[in-house]
């Protein structure tokens, strides 16, 4: 089938990095500067992505692959292929419509992105608070008084936090 197709369609022989040039009797021409084709048999080359403004170039465009962008320091990528950049906050803060704001009492954020999450409720597991929480750190749960017998484990790490999402105020 491939042989038959290539006999019928000369463009199928054009490799990645080239395009099938209708203006030149369907011969394979190299992609022009600032363009690429990532698959064979293409009739046009795609324009390379330009990483401008808050975007930085992570990988240069080549004749066979698009440029890849990331974000300037102080910002992080969002969306498929880093389609957007969102500003970082400090640990102990979350990004809201009014900018970076400190986590409310009883919540924390240990990252530069995402939302403030409630401290672990140690008492739900019958534990006591061994180390108090802060804006930047969750509480550390310790044993309940009844567990303080010889040989008992002294510290239970808090349950893993869920993946931070983003919910502006």
């Amino acid at each position: 089938f491939e042989r038959t197709r290539s006999l019928q369609d000369p463009c199928s022989n054009c490799p990645a990095g080239t395009f099938c040039d209708n203006n030149r009797n369907q011969i394979c021409s190299p992609c022009p500067p600032n363009s690429f084709s990532s698959a064979g048999g293409q009739r046009t080359c795609d324009i390379c992505r330009q990483c401008k403004g808050v975007f930085r170039t992570r990988k240069e465009c080549s004749s066979t692959s698009n440029a890849e962008c990331d974000c300037t320091p102080g910002f992080h990528c969002l969306g498929a292929g880093c389609s957007m950049c969102e500003q970082d906050c400090k640990q102990g803060q979350e990004l809201t419509k009014k900018g970076c704001k400190d986590c409310c009492f009883g919540t924390f954020n240990d990252q530069k992105r995402g939302i403030c999450r409630p401290w672990t409720n140690c008492s739900l597991d019958g534990k006591s608070v061994l180390v108090n929480g802060t804006k930047e750190r969750d509480v550390v749960c310790g044993p309940s008084p009844a567990d303080l017998s010889p040989g008992a484990s002294s510290v239970t790490p808090p349950a893993p936090a869920r993946e931070p999402g983003h919910s502006p105020q």
């Epitope: 403004g53 808050v54 969002l78 969306g79 389609s83 957007m84 950049c85 969102e86 500003q87 990004l95 419509k97 983003h166 919910s167 502006p168």
Partner: nanobody
Framework: EVQLVESGGGLVQPGGSLRLSCAAS????????MTWFRQAPGKGLEWVAH????????YYEDSVEGRFTISRDNAKNSVYLQMNSLRAEDTAVYYC????????????????WGQGTTVTVSS
């Protein structure tokens, strides 16, 4: 081509005023939140203000609240930043940026950025 072009920067004395403009082209302007950022010499980028698609919501960074006013004219595909009572610490390159799809509902990501206009506050 999607484009943002800022203008209106310049040298102004402390206490003075400037009005920055950002002209948008190549996209449906009225469908996007618009944002102003700034970058002072030797510092990182700082968010200044943003405005909802229809202009009904406006938010400001604490240090500019009450001195700066963001506005937009969707008929002219433009967003503005009126800056009053300027201080030396307002000296920066000011950038206009477009909020990406879903801005303010699920994120505050921007996807298009202007080239910037320089504001210098000095006596």
């Amino acid at each position: 081509e999607v484009q943002l072009v800022e203008s209106g920067g310049g040298l102004v004395q402390p206490g003075g005023s400037l009005r920055l403009s950002c002209a948008a082209s190549g996209f449906t302007f009225s469908s996007h939140w618009m944002t102003w950022f700034r970058q002072a010499p030797g510092k990182g980028l700082e968010w200044v203000a943003h405005i909802k698609e229809d202009g009904s919501e406006k938010y400001y960074e604490d240090s500019v609240e009450g001195r700066f006013t963001i506005s937009r004219d969707n008929a002219k595909n433009s967003v503005y930043l009126q800056m009053n009572s300027l201080r030396a610490e307002d000296t920066a390159v000011y950038y206009c940026a477009r909020g990406g799809d879903g801005y303010s509902d699920s994120h505050f990501g921007v996807d298009v950025w202007g080239q910037g206009t320089t504001v210098t506050v000095s006596s």
